[in-house]
Amino acid sequence: NQDLPVIKCVLINHKNNDSSVGKSSSYPMVSESPEDLGCALRPQSSGTVYEAAAVEVDVSASITLQVLVDAPGNISCLWVFKHSSLNCQPHFDLQNRGVVSMVILKMTETQAGEYLLFIQSEATNYTILFTVSIRNTLLYTLRRPYFRKMENQDALVCISESVPEPIVEWVLCDSQGESCKEESPAVVKKEEKVLHELFGTDIRCCARNELGRECTRLFTIDLNQTPQTTLPQLFLKVGEPLWIRCKAVHVNHGFGLTWELENKALEEGNYFEMSTYSTNRTMIRILFAFVSSVARNDTGYYTCSSSKHPSQSALVTIVEKGFINATNSSEDYEIDQYEEFCFSVRFKAYPQIRCTWTFSRKSFPCEQKGLDNGYSISKFCNHKHQPGEYIFHAENDDAQFTKMFTLNIRRKPQVLAEASASQASCFSDGYPLPSWTWKKCSDKSPNCTEEITEGVWNRKANRKVFGQWVSSSTLNMSEAIKGFLVKCCAYNSLGTSCETILLNSPGPFPFIQDNIS
């Protein structure tokens, strides 16, 4: 076909110059020579479809899929991956070829799959298909479960796409609030994938394999409960299933429930109702709103209305990519030696994050607690009053977040001294960082009150030990003080400490340590 453009598909493998966990470079820096992926016309396909050779990528590797188009005039394009459209900005190279690139940083299982590139040129439209898979180092995973409606039944199936295939259990609770904690007697667990009893107060599905346990709660609006002060919000990514349950109890059966999205009734096939009588003969109705695979236009206010209850709403937000929203500015804290204190990070994220707290190259478990306003909080209290730098790191499928904290412990200086043939040095790690004085002890000054100002060199931050600053002061030896005892004193707002040194000795000779409060 004369009109078809000349197309070249290439793979560029990048050498990440930082492969450390928890760091993400904005763009891989060093790249190897491009590998030609062929891009042959696909036979018997409707429309013009080019297919690139399959791409196998190592876990955590960074690559660029690139298409070079030799066609006259401007081109416009669109990438589609897993039903999501992704931004596409073509540019032109020195040979005036159109260049379209897709960068995949730190390859993960979630980024494996088919990448479709739709290109529109002045002459014709065509599609290019890339298939990207992870090289065969099997990755066991544990993914958050999701719900599906059971075919031809009013029941929910719980699915977790994990390996090894997880043990799935439903966690049900019929009481309110605190009594629905995991080990409470009010909690019932059912080790099965299908749940028929959907009237409970709190319904969660959990999946566990040797990597741990992940749970998903069935998002519920209860019309008999007082609405939250802030509107409940539910985040989903394009392509994920949406499930919202509306529940209402009334003295008799004479009431109905309806779902609306932005004041328009949900289409049939996007909801189903169930009802039952409770033990006290009141009627319980539940109405599910569900979308098997959400798109951007499913975003909005979902309102459940009843003929006998005030209506309530939830805001459903569909996002292209996951996110972690939090302030990443570093924070410094100053506490007393026995003061109770916890670091905390408040964030909003979807999908749920995994996080770690790190101090002195050691990682600590990270717990998250959901707040009523849609935010979550992670606290770290296990610092054991050790000063230094603490790092909070969070990741989900699509985003990474790091926040630094510095902890300073207010305490009186502790002084260590050492001497060489030419100088004497004193070190202290008190906080606030101490100031220094040097004094000479002589016949004229037996109490060591004669201050030395010549030859003193103070360094405020000599070395940083995991974020803990150490201050030092050095006295260069002169003939005037050789053979004498000298005293170095470090003082801050909490007190003073001193060390006495004999200056003619070649080695360290701490004579007396004075602790003057």
Epitope: Y140, E210, R213
Partner: antibody, heavy 129, light 107 residues
Framework: QVQLVESGGGVVQPGRSLRLSCAAS????????MHWVRQAPGKGLEWVAV????????FYADSVKGRFTISRDNSKNTLYLQMNSLRAEDTAVYYC??????????????????????WGQGTTVTVSS | DIQMTQSPSSLSASVGDRVTITCRAS??????LNWYQQKPGKAPKLLIY???SLQSGVPSRFSGSGSGTEFTLTISSLQPEDFATYYC?????????FGGGTKVEIK
């Protein structure tokens, strides 16, 4: 070098208990899932149990569920198998084996899994009256 | 539980022969299958992981193939040190299950 050494085997009467240990060295023990596998005399291999890298999750073969408990002490680099209510059919050589290595890839926790790639030499358990 | 059926249960072969052992899973296990070699009185040794990936240090005469339910271990040219029992293992779901084993003997 990477090594696993089992101990604690012996002759025990039916209904009694025994505790096996597996000492690990040469690798970061706390980053790996760990398994117990057994082999009855003249028979094939039978998987017994697995424990996650942090000890929070365990899974068992139906034949030992409720009687055996797998556990670990990461501070001592040691894996354990507590065997209660022992039966004649539990007579076997018991091996410990290293499983997957923990990783976190973009928020998804996972194991890189190359199979049970390191095995101990085995310890013999004989259940007999 | 997933059943792993290994065949043959034993075979006789000569040095230099090409040997093929198969393993069939009762349901799909994707590529979550390993092959092990065991000699009398010794612990098993991993040969192949992920159905077809050769474990480092294992001679290239060993190869694995298959996915889903049908898997094959091939020894392209049998060597004297290859006479042993071979097991497959599925680790797609709990409980993990081994095949019954294939004993490769000298003809």
């Amino acid at each position: 070098q990477v090594q696993l050494v089992e101990s604690g085997g012996g002759v025990v009467q039916p209904g009694r208990s025994l505790r096996l240990s597996c000492a690990a060295s040469g690798f970061t023990f706390s980053s790996y899932g760990m398994h117990w596998v057994r082999q009855a005399p003249g028979k094939g291999l039978e998987w017994v149990a697995v424990i996650s890298y942090d000890g929070s999750n365990e899974f068992y073969a139906d034949s030992v569920k409720g009687r055996f408990t797998i556990s670990r002490d990461n501070s001592k680099n040691t894996l354990y198998l507590q065997m209660n209510s022992l039966r004649a059919e539990d007579t076997a050589v018991y091996y410990c084996a290293r499983g997957g290595e923990i990783t976190m890839v973009r928020g998804v926790i996972g194991y890189y899994y190359y199979g049970m790639d390191v095995w101990g030499q085995g310890t013999t358990v004989t259940v007999s009256s | 539980d997933i059943q792993m059926t290994q065949s043959p249960s034993s075979l006789s072969a000569s040095v230099g022969d090409r040997v093929t052992i198969t393993c069939r899973a009762s349901q799909s296990i994707s590529s979550y299958l390993n092959w092990y070699q065991q000699k009398p009185g010794k612990a098993p040794k991993l040969l192949i992981y992920a159905a077809s990936s050769l474990q480092s240090g294992v001679p290239s005469r060993f190869s694995g193939s298959g996915s889903g339910t049908e898997f094959t271990l091939t020894i392209s040219s049998l060597q004297p040190e290859d006479f042993a029992t071979y097991y497959c293992l599925q680790h797609n779901s709990y409980p993990l299950t081994f095949g019954g084993g294939t004993k490769v003997e000298i003809k």
